[in-house]
Every structure is written in C-alpha cells, then in structure tokens.
C-alpha cells in the first residue's frame, strides 16, 4: 500500500499553517493548523510539543497533560477550567497553550 502524494501515513500529523505574533514584549502568540491521519479512536492533539494523534478520550475529559504535550523533562500542569496546559522548563520558563 503506497501513499498518494499529499496523503499522510496513519497515525501521523503535519503542520499546515503557522502564524506567529511577536508584537508584545516577552510574549509570542502562535497559532497553528494541522492535518492528521489518525487511527480509529484517536484525534489530532499535541505530543512532545508537536502535532500528534492522541487518544480521543483525552479530549473529552480535557486531561490535556495525558497527551504528553510537553518536552521530556518539562512539567505539565492543567490551566484553570482545563482550558489548556502549561509546560514548565527546568529553568522555570513557562509556555502556556490554550485550546480553542
């Protein structure tokens, strides 16, 4: 079974668009659109800070840290109201991701 051009292998994702807004000091807002080809029972998400197919039940429960969204060595915490998550680097720098 060979993939057609533009067709993704099952269980993989690719970034389609990436917009960055660095107009505010010490703050970069990034919005990305991804295309995924996921196994049954999976949905597009984030693993190790990259687009990935994740267990669809994670999205339903909003247990975002169960996607393993942070890099290895970073700490993951849910935002209030489970509106997203933060990844805290060992040095203390925090990256916040909100789900819309």
């Amino acid at each position: 079974q060979f993939l057609k051009e533009g067709q993704l292998a099952a269980g993989t994702c690719e970034i389609v668009t990436l917009d960055r807004d660095s107009s505010q000091p010490r703050r970069t807002i990034a919005r990305q659109t991804v295309k995924c080809s996921c196994f049954p029972g999976q949905i597009a998400g984030t693993t190790r800070a990259r687009p990935a197919c994740v267990d669809a039940r994670i999205i339903k429960t909003k247990q975002w840290c169960d996607m393993l969204p942070c890099l290895e060595g970073e700490g993951c915490d849910l935002l209030i109201n489970r509106s997203g998550w933060t990844c805290t680097q060992p040095g203390g720098r925090i990256k916040t991701t909100t789900v819309s």
């Epitope: 292998a9 099952a10 269980g11 196994f39 049954p40 029972g41 693993t47 190790r48 994670i58 429960t61 247990q63 840290c65 169960d66 393993l68 942070c70 290895e72 060595g73 970073e74 700490g75 993951c76």
Partner: antibody, heavy 113, light 107 residues
Framework: QSLEESGGRLVTPGTPLTLTCTAS????????MNWVRQAPGKGLEWIGI?????TTYYAGWAKGRFTISKTSTTVDLKITSPTSEDTATYFC??????????WGPGTLVTVSL | ELDLTQTPPSLSASVGGTVTINCLAS??????LAWYQQKPGKPPTLLIS???NLESGVPPRFSGSGSGTDYTLTIGGVQAEDAATYFC?????????FGAGTNVEIK
C-alpha cells in the same frame, strides 16, 4: 534511563500482592506506564496502562483482577486475588506512541499453596 | 479485539543466512507494529517500531516491512548473537497485543 520492578514473591492463592515500578533518569509523568507479564516459557501479555492523570485502561481479561495506580515516583500493580494462573514474571514498561521503548528487568510472582 | 498470528513458532538458521518472521493481524493496524527481541532471563528489547523504523543501536541486518494486516521481520546475515525469541506487537488501539513469539535457533 531505567525501570526496576520490586515486590515479586511466593504468595498463596487469594492473597493480594502489590508490585512496584520505580523509574530512574526520567519522570513517570512524562510517559504512559504499562504492566506486561510473561508466564514461564510463554509469551507476553499486556495487562494495562496508566496515564499521567491516573486514567487507566486494562486488557479485557485483566479487568477486576488487577489495579494499576501511581504516585509521583512509582507505578504500582495490585493483583487483587492471585491464582496459580498469575504465576509469571511481571514487567513494567514505558510508552509514548504505543510501543515499549524501555522495560524493567522484571519481578517473579509465584502463586502456590 | 486484535489478534496477531506469528509464524513460524520456531526456526533454525545458519550463521550468515536469512531469517524471515511473519506477523498477521486480524484487522488493519495501519503499520502500527513493533518488533522485540528477548533472550532468556531478560526483558524484551525494542528492535523496530512503525513497521520499519530501526531503533537506535540496532544492527542494520534487522529490517521490517509490511502494511495493512501483513508484516515481516527479516534478519539478513544472521549472527550467533541473534539467537533469541522475537515478538511482534500491535499498537493501533487498546488492548495492546503481542504475537505468540518465534524462537530462533542458530546452527
């Protein structure tokens, strides 16, 4: 980076037993942690998985027979009411994408009168 | 529930020869298949993930192929240290499932 299981021993049927998996060199909360067992001379059987939040999923045959739980530093497997069929080496193993990249050396559980 | 049929259950090979192990899935697993090597008294070690992606440190004589329901592990130029039991594992959905294993003896 490594895993080590402990708690395996000879138990009598029906006596609950808890096995513990300890990680070195990485954080358990950055991985999905699994338990897999292997009866003497037999193949590998996946028992179940625990997510960072504590959410668990089990193989159909393992539901009710095993309980997986975790702390910040360990992952436990409780064999609720062991029978002779549960005699096996029990491994903990980590995953991110569904395959097991690091395994512990295993701990032997023998269930006998 | 996924079932993985691994063949043959055992085989004997000569040093320098080629070994082929097959894994047949009861349903399409979308190339979500891994292969492990296990030696007596030791835990399994990951050889290949995603059907054909060789793990770091695994000799290039090991290779994997397949799609859909049919998958193959090939060891080309078999060495004495390749004597072991090999398992396939599917991970497209829960429960995660293993094949029954293939015991490889080297003559």
């Amino acid at each position: 980076q490594s895993l080590e299981e402990s708690g395996g021993r000879l138990v009598t049927p029906g006596t609950p037993l808890t096995l513990t998996c300890t990680a070195s060199g990485f954080s358990l909360s950055s991985y999905y942690m699994n338990w897999v067992r292997q009866a003497p001379g037999k193949g590998l059987e996946w028992i179940g998985i625990i997510y960072p939040s504590g959410t668990t999923y089990y193989a159909g045959w393992a539901k009710g027979r095993f309980t997986i739980s975790k702390t910040s530093t360990t992952v436990d497997l409780k064999i609720t009411s062991p029978t002779s069929e549960d005699t096996a080496t029990y491994f903990c193993a980590r995953t991110v994408s569904g395959y097991f990249d690091i395994w512990g050396p295993g701990t032997l559980v023998t269930v006998s009168l | 529930e996924l079932d993985l049929t691994q063949t043959p259950p055992s085989l004997s090979a000569s040093v320098g020869g080629t070994v082929t192990i097959n894994c047949l899935a009861s349903e399409d697993i979308y190339s979500a298949l891994a292969w492990y090597q296990q030696k007596p008294g030791k835990p399994p070690t990951l050889l290949i993930s995603g059907t054909s992606n060789l793990e770091s440190g695994v000799p290039p004589r090991f290779s994997g192929s397949g799609s859909g329901t049919d998958y193959t592990l090939t060891i080309g130029g078999v060495q004495a240290e390749d004597a072991a039991t090999y398992f396939c594992q599917g991970y497209s959905s829960y429960p995660l499932t293993f094949g029954a294993g293939t015991n490889v003896e080297i003559k």
